[in-house]
Amino acid sequence: QAGPLPKPTLWAEPGSVISWGNSVTIWCQGTLEAREYRLDKEESPAPWDRQNPLEPKNKARFSIPSMTEDYAGRYRCYYRSPVGWSQPSDPLELVMTGAYSKPTLSALPSPLVTSGKSVTLLCQSRSPMDTFLLIKERAAHPLLHLRSEHGAQQHQAEFPMSPVTSVHGGTYRCFSSHGFSHYLLSHPSDPLELIVSGSLEDPRPSPTRSVSTAAGPEDQPLMPTGSVPHSGLRRHWE
C-alpha cells in the first residue's frame, strides 16, 4: 500500500499581505494526478472553494478580485487524486492591510543613533489597539509583535533596541491591529529611517532568540533587547 499523498504547496501572489481592495491569487500546487483542488479557510464552512486543476493538472488557482476583511485568515489546501485526498498543505496566512487608520512611528531619543547606544521605536495609535507590529524593509522575517495581555488595549508599543549596531539601520514601518482579527492590520505608518553612525567596525548583534533561516546576517529579523515596557504588552516573535 502506498503512503499518504504528498501535501500540496500553497502560496499567494503577489504576496500574503494585501491592501484592502487589491486583487490576490491563491495557488495550490499538487501532483499531475490531481483531479480536484480544495481550499479551506479556518473558521469557515469547508470547503471554502473548489477548483478544477489547470493544465497540466498539478495546480489550481483561487482568485480574490478585491481584498476585503472576509478573505483575511488562515488557509489550507488539498487535492484529490484517484487514490483519495492528500494531506493538507502548510497553512497560508492571508493578511489584509488598510483595516484601520495608520499609526505613528517615531524613534526615541532620535532616529539618528550612535552604534552601541540605545534607541526605542515607538508605535502609537490614536485609538486603542491590542497588537502592534514593527516591520523592517528587506528583512527576511520582518515581523515583530507586541500583543497586549488579557485583552487590555493600548495606544502604543515600545520596541527597544540595545545595543544598536549597523544591522539595525534601515527603514521601518509599523502596523496596529484590533482584537477583531489578527489578520486585519492598519494602514502602514509613514516610514521611519533609522540611521546608525560610527558603525564601521560593529560586530553583528547576537539575537535574543535563535532564528532558523538560510538568509545572511543582513536578513536576520530585528531582535531588539531589553524588557517589555510596562504597558501590559507581551512580545511575540513571528
Epitope: 476583511e69 489584509m96 488598510g98 487608520s101 495608520k102 505613528t104 490614536r126 485609538s127 484590533h178 492598519s186
Partner: antibody, heavy 120, light 110 residues
Framework: EVQLVESGGGLVQPGGSLRLSCAAS?????????ISWVRQAPGKGLEWVSS?????????YYATWAKGRFTISRDNSKNTLYLQMNSLRAEDTAVYYC???????????WGQGTLVTVSS | DLVMTQSPSTLSASVGDRVTITCQAS??????LAWYQQKPGKPPKLLIY???TLASGVSSRFSGSGSGTEFTLTISSLQPDDVATYYC????????????FGGGTKVEIK
C-alpha cells in the same frame, strides 16, 4: 478644494430623530483619517460626540453620554459622513460640526456647522 | 477617565501683553495635544498641534509647550485680532471619554 460641508440640521421636537450629513470634497473619507462629530451648545464649549476610523473596518467610538442614542456612519461611495440622532432632548440643541483628524492627531479641517434645535 | 482641565476660563489683558493659557490632562497624553482658536459664529481654527508645532498660516505670536500632563499656550504679544475663545484637545479616541476638549478660555482685551 478640500472641505467638509454639513447639512440636515433643523428644528425637531423632543423625542424626535434627525440625521446629519457631512460631505467631504478634495479628499477621500476612506483615506487614512479619522472623522469626528463635535457639537457646541449656544454659549458653551466644544464637546466631542463621536468618531469613525477611515479604515475598511470603520471602528466607531462615542462619548459616554452619546452611546445608545447617536450613531455615526459613512458612505464611501458618496464620500459622506452621517450622524443619526435619536430620542433628542432639549440639551442636544447645538451647532454640530464634522471635523477631520490629520496625521498630526489634531482636527485640521472643520465644516461650517449645522444648527440642531430641539424644542416643542 | 481622561479629562482636560483648562485655565483660566476667562482672561483679560492689554494689547501687547504676554498671555498664557494652561491645559492639564488627568493622565499622560505624551505630546498629543492641540490648541484651537474660535471666534463667534465660526468653526474652530487649528493653531498648534503635537503640543508645540505651529499650524500652517498661524502667526508666530502663538507658541505651545509641554508634554505628558501639563501644557501651555502662549501669545507673546496680544493683539485685538486675538480676541477669541481658545480650546485644548487631546488626540486620543476611545469609548471611555466624556470629551476630548478642555473647557475653553475666553480672551478679552482690557
Amino acid at each position: 478644494e478640500v472641505q467638509l460641508v454639513e447639512s440636515g440640521g433643523g428644528l425637531v421636537q423632543p423625542g424626535g430623530s434627525l440625521r446629519l450629513s457631512c460631505a467631504a470634497s478634495g479628499f477621500s473619507l476612506s483615506s487614512s483619517y479619522w472623522i469626528s462629530w463635535v457639537r457646541q451648545a449656544p454659549g458653551k464649549g466644544l464637546e466631542w460626540v463621536s468618531s469613525i476610523d477611515s479604515g475598511s473596518v470603520g471602528i466607531t467610538y462615542y462619548a459616554t453620554w452619546a452611546k445608545g442614542r447617536f450613531t455615526i456612519s459613512r458612505d464611501n461611495s458618496k464620500n459622506t459622513l452621517y450622524l443619526q440622532m435619536n430620542s433628542l432632548r432639549a440639551e442636544d440643541t447645538a451647532v454640530y460640526y464634522c471635523a477631520r483628524h490629520g496625521d498630526n492627531w489634531a482636527l485640521d479641517l472643520w465644516g461650517q456647522g449645522t444648527l440642531v434645535t430641539v424644542s416643542s | 477617565d481622561l479629562v482636560m482641565t483648562q485655565s483660566p476660563s476667562t482672561l483679560s489683558a492689554s494689547v501687547g501683553d504676554r498671555v498664557t493659557i494652561t491645559c492639564q490632562a488627568s493622565q499622560s497624553i505624551n505630546s498629543w495635544l492641540a490648541w484651537y482658536q474660535q471666534k463667534p459664529g465660526k468653526p474652530p481654527k487649528l493653531l498648534i498641534y503635537k503640543a508645540s508645532t505651529l499650524a500652517s498660516g498661524v502667526s508666530s505670536r502663538f507658541s505651545g509647550s509641554g508634554s505628558g500632563t501639563e501644557f501651555t499656550l502662549t501669545i507673546s504679544s496680544l493683539q485685538p485680532d486675538d480676541v477669541a475663545t481658545y480650546y485644548c484637545q487631546h488626540g486620543y479616541i476611545r469609548g471611555d471619554l466624556d470629551n476630548v476638549f478642555g473647557g475653553g478660555t475666553k480672551v478679552e482685551i482690557k
